[in-house]
């Protein structure tokens, strides 16, 4: 179920790469965030809490990522025109219950000025 386009700036360009911002509510304690390109899983990050509130972060499909208290950022480097596509943040919430899934996304436009190694 697609919940719609992100109501925030999802793509932040810098140095020939892009930071893709996937937000989640502050109350979420345990979750899995997947970055989808079209229907393909590019990256994922799972945050769980063990006994004594020890936090565990795992990735099955690893990308450079950054976790904050209400977002996961995935970083893609060496942009070229093949990166242009729909990208989705697929959030699975485990805690607080119940299990919930949301899908938000947007289209990544690639312009010449954002490419990594432009020919001068």
């Amino acid at each position: 179920e697609i919940n719609g386009s992100a109501n925030y700036e999802m793509f932040i360009f810098h140095n020939g790469g892009v930071q893709i911002l996937c937000k989640y509510p502050d109350i979420v304690q345990q979750f899995k965030m997947q970055l989808l390109k079209g229907g393909q899983i590019l990256c994922d990050l799972t945050k769980t809490k063990g006994s004594g509130n020890t936090v565990s972060i795992k990735s099955l499909k690893f990308c450079h990522s950054q976790l904050s208290n209400n977002s996961v950022s995935f970083f893609l480097y060496n942009l070229d025109h093949s990166h242009a596509n729909y990208y989705f943040c697929n959030l699975s919430i485990f805690d607080p219950p119940p299990f919930k899934v949301t899908l938000t996304g947007g289209y990544l436009h690639i312009y010449e000025s954002q490419l990594c190694c432009q020919l001068k």
Epitope: P25, F94, D95, P98, K100
Partner: antibody, heavy 120, light 106 residues
Amino acid sequence: QVQLVESGGGLVKPGGSLRLSCAASGFTFSDYYMNWFRQAPGKGLEWVSYISSGDGTIYYTDSVKGRFTISRDSAKNSLYLQMNSLRAEDTAVYYCARDRLTGTGGMDVWGQGTTVTVSS
Amino acid sequence: DIQMTQSPSTLSASVGDRVTITCRASQSISSWLAWYQQKPGKAPNLLIYKASSLESGVPSRFSGSGSGTEFTLTISSLQPDDFATYYCQQYYSYWTFGQGTKVEIK
């Protein structure tokens, strides 16, 4: 057809115990997150406890923590609620209910309910 | 805890009427809201999930709308089978229900 059938309710004295059962049929029980809800006479609905599929993560409402224990047996397609140290305020009809599988929420299948009366 | 407040508590209506029930959450719950119908001595029956999605098998005269803190359940043309009590339920964080709205015959 898809069905949940509760049993095990009855009259019990304050401080006593009961074990409620919920027999599932017509669907793959092990795939679903399951809940117990209750409804005191003439009152509204209240969530009691939740157990996830897979790892069996468990949650309780504050008023029953330390007294009630939820469990499931996928081999028997059954959900249980062990109720100890019962109080008058636990008097209610108890329902088991299945959470929608898709992560969109809502309890799409409910049992018919079993009545628990706590009285001296 | 998230509190859910339904209004009205009781609603008197006639067959064919358009009926609207409101549910207000004490904080934003996005669209994580369900609506149930319950008849005396029976279990609740899911009508709407995710604020506006109609559960399979539920008549199309039932519809839900809203997001954030304000939600409504609308019955476009009340039928004899619709006289019952209706509950909203948030599941943004755990589960809490509104106190119920009894729809009775005028």
